[in-house]
Interface confidence: low
């Protein structure tokens, strides 16, 4: 059973709320609040909880608040990907995914946010202060990772707050000229606002667009920041890393990755199905159970496959160009 | 067949930087992780970290974190690696190394870190007072 | 950091003799392995990646087998130009690790 909350997300007044007039003039204000807050340094937020059916099991949830296009996702725990910490999973929007054990599915929940589900390793009681990391790449911000744990006192069932960046950091230069640009918008946003402050103040309103939102037990910055840009968060159920360090992959390939062609995004097919075919369109992606392709560059599966669809929130887009075969 | 062509031999003092170069040619630059890879005088292989071009994401091994950095020209299809803080530990040869191409996933280019098919020469560095 | 504890350190053999060296992983690398060739003075080639596939090009006496944790690198005939030392290699996670390496030479 999971327990979530939604997310009040900032919404403009209905009209009928106030009069004509007084609708228009507030509707310059809510533009640049949504600029205003969404703009500036991206943030990328990361959610842990346990899950109450799977006592070896956590729920980690990680997503990215800023405008550009993300290239990359990298999740790690023990620790940042490349500082001490072990990846679990990589996702690339075009390219596919490829997952270490005891990841279970890594997959897209948005285009801004991933989810990831760790295999119970079967630990007598799961380690709370495991900490999970998520590193976006994206464009033009650069890179940013940020990191996150359960809450010592957490009970099964109960998710954590969402944690901004707890480490966020900038690995690359980012094109942040943005903000100045909305410097003055935001300045007047302010004029305006005080200009109206003896109406009543817009009420604060759960999104209608955003059904799997999540709960945070208080409102922040950074969950306006996500709310206005009607961001959702991913589901990342993960298991508590052994004491040994080595887990082996439920189903005996420890990782898997692939891709699947728009056409074929309609119904599932084996891989004898679409094993050949040529670069794919983006379209959606499909986890495959242990299909860890490599007779010089491409592996058959261990096993039979599991397939399972998730669609590409960006839709389909033709991949950049030729690229060379191992 | 790629290449890659290294800078020349440095010779530093400690507490400098040193900044190593690493051209490529024959091939395509971005098209797959570079990674830096140090060898100290009769030890066997470091891997400081690595760069993947095409996603323009990094990664540092935790012993250098913070000391070293690397960047990529694609105009020039070069990468750098640049150590701070050097010490007489950090006298060894420097390698640059990448994967030929990206492999290959139901026909689809996966690029990450795998095994290293194409070394530079190396670049010497000699760390002393 | 998973460790990668290779041995023997070194091992003399008679041209013809085959010649096996072994690498054990700190935890469950899939495939995810290589070994390298390295001759003094010189940049190690790669000779086996996927733990088991010949690089384009290598002699077919040289193999590889394994998965998980333990794997095998085989010279099935040693000949004089394969005096060196030898690495593993895993890139199944970060930071990526080295053996200590085989320094192979001839009795």
């Known amino acids: 059973m999971r327990t979530e909350a939604q997310v009040p997300a900032l919404q403009p007044p209905e009209p009928g709320l106030e009069g004509a007039m007084g609708h228009r003039t507030l509707v310059l204000p809510w533009v640049l609040l949504t600029l205003c807050v969404t703009a500036g340094t991206p943030e990328v937020w990361v959610q842990v909880r346990m899950e109450a059916t799977e006592l070896s099991s956590f729920t980690i949830r990680c997503g990215f608040l800023g405008s550009g296009s993300i290239s990359l996702v990298t999740v790690s725990w023990g620790g940042p990907n490349g500082a001490g910490g072990t990846t679990l999973a990589v996702l690339h929007p075009e390219r596919g995914i490829r997952q270490w054990a005891p990841a279970r599915q890594a997959r897209w929940e948005t285009q801004s946010s991933i989810s990831l589900i760790l295999e119970g390793s079967g630990a007598s009681s799961p380690c709370a202060n495991t900490t999970f990391c998520c590193k976006f790449a994206s464009f033009p911000e650069g890179s940013w990772e940020a990191c996150g744990s359960l809450p010592p006192s957490s009970d099964p069932g109960l998710s954590a707050p969402p944690t901004p960046a707890p480490i966020l950091r900038a690995d690359l230069a980012g094109i942040l000229g943005v903000s100045g640009v909305l410097l003055f918008g935001c300045v007047y946003l302010l004029h305006l606002l005080r200009r109206h402050k003896h109406r009543p103040a817009p009420r604060l309103q759960p999104s209608r667009t955003s059904p799997q939102a999540p709960r945070a037990r208080a409102w922040a910055p950074s969950q306006a920041s996500q709310a206005a840009l009607h961001v959702p968060y991913a589901t990342i159920n993960t298991s508590c890393r052994p004491a040994t360090l080595d887990t082996a992959h439920p189903h005996g390939g420890p990782s898997w990755w692939a891709s699947l062609p728009t056409h074929a995004a309609h119904r599932p097919q084996g891989p004898a199905a679409w094993a050949s075919t040529p670069i794919p369109a983006r379209g959606s992606f499909v986890s495959v159970e242990n299909g860890l392709y490599a007779q010089a560059g491409e592996r058959p599966p261990h096993t039979g496959p599991g397939l399972t669809l998730f669609p590409d929130p960006r839709g389909p887009r033709a991949m950049e160009g030729p690229l060379g075969v191992r | 067949q790629m290449q890659l062509v290294q800078s020349g031999a440095e010779v530093k003092k400690p507490g400098s930087s040193v900044k190593v170069s690493c051209k490529a040619s024959?091939?395509?630059?971005?098209?797959?992780?570079i990674s830096w890879v140090r060898q100290a005088p009769g030890q066997g292989f470091e891997w400081m970290g690595g760069i993947i071009p095409i996603y323009g994401i990094t990664d540092y091994a935790q012993k250098f974190q913070g000391r070293v950095t690397i960047t990529t020209d694609e105009s020039t299809s070069t990468a750098y690696m640049e150590l701070s803080s050097l010490t007489s530990e950090d006298t060894a040869v420097y390698y640059c190394?990448?994967?030929?191409?990206?492999?290959?996933?139901?026909?689809?280019?996966?690029?990450?870190?795998?095994?290293?098919?194409?070394w530079g020469q190396g670049t010497t560095v000699t760390v002393s007072s | 950091d998973i460790q990668m504890t290779q041995s023997p350190s070194s091992l003399s053999a008679s041209v013809g003799d085959r010649v096996t060296i072994t690498c054990q992983a700190s935890r469950d690398i899939s495939d995810s392995l290589s070994w390298y060739q390295q001759k003094p003075g010189k940049a190690p080639k790669l000779l086996i990646f996927?733990?088991?596939n010949l690089k384009t090009g290598v002699s077919s006496r040289f193999s590889g087998s394994g998965s998980g944790t333990d794997f095998t690198f085989t010279i099935s005939s040693l000949q004089p130009e394969d005096i060196a030392t030898y690495y593993c290699?895993?890139?199944?996670?970060?930071?990526?690790?080295f053996g200590g390496g085989t320094k192979v030479e001839i009795k």
């Open positions: 190394a990448r994967d030929d191409t990206a492999r290959r996933v139901r026909g689809v280019p996966y690029y990450y870190y795998y095994a290293m098919d194409v």
């Open positions: 024959g091939g395509t630059f971005s098209s797959s992780a």
């Open positions: 290699h895993q890139y199944d996670n970060l930071p990526l690790t």
């Open positions: 996927d733990a088991s």
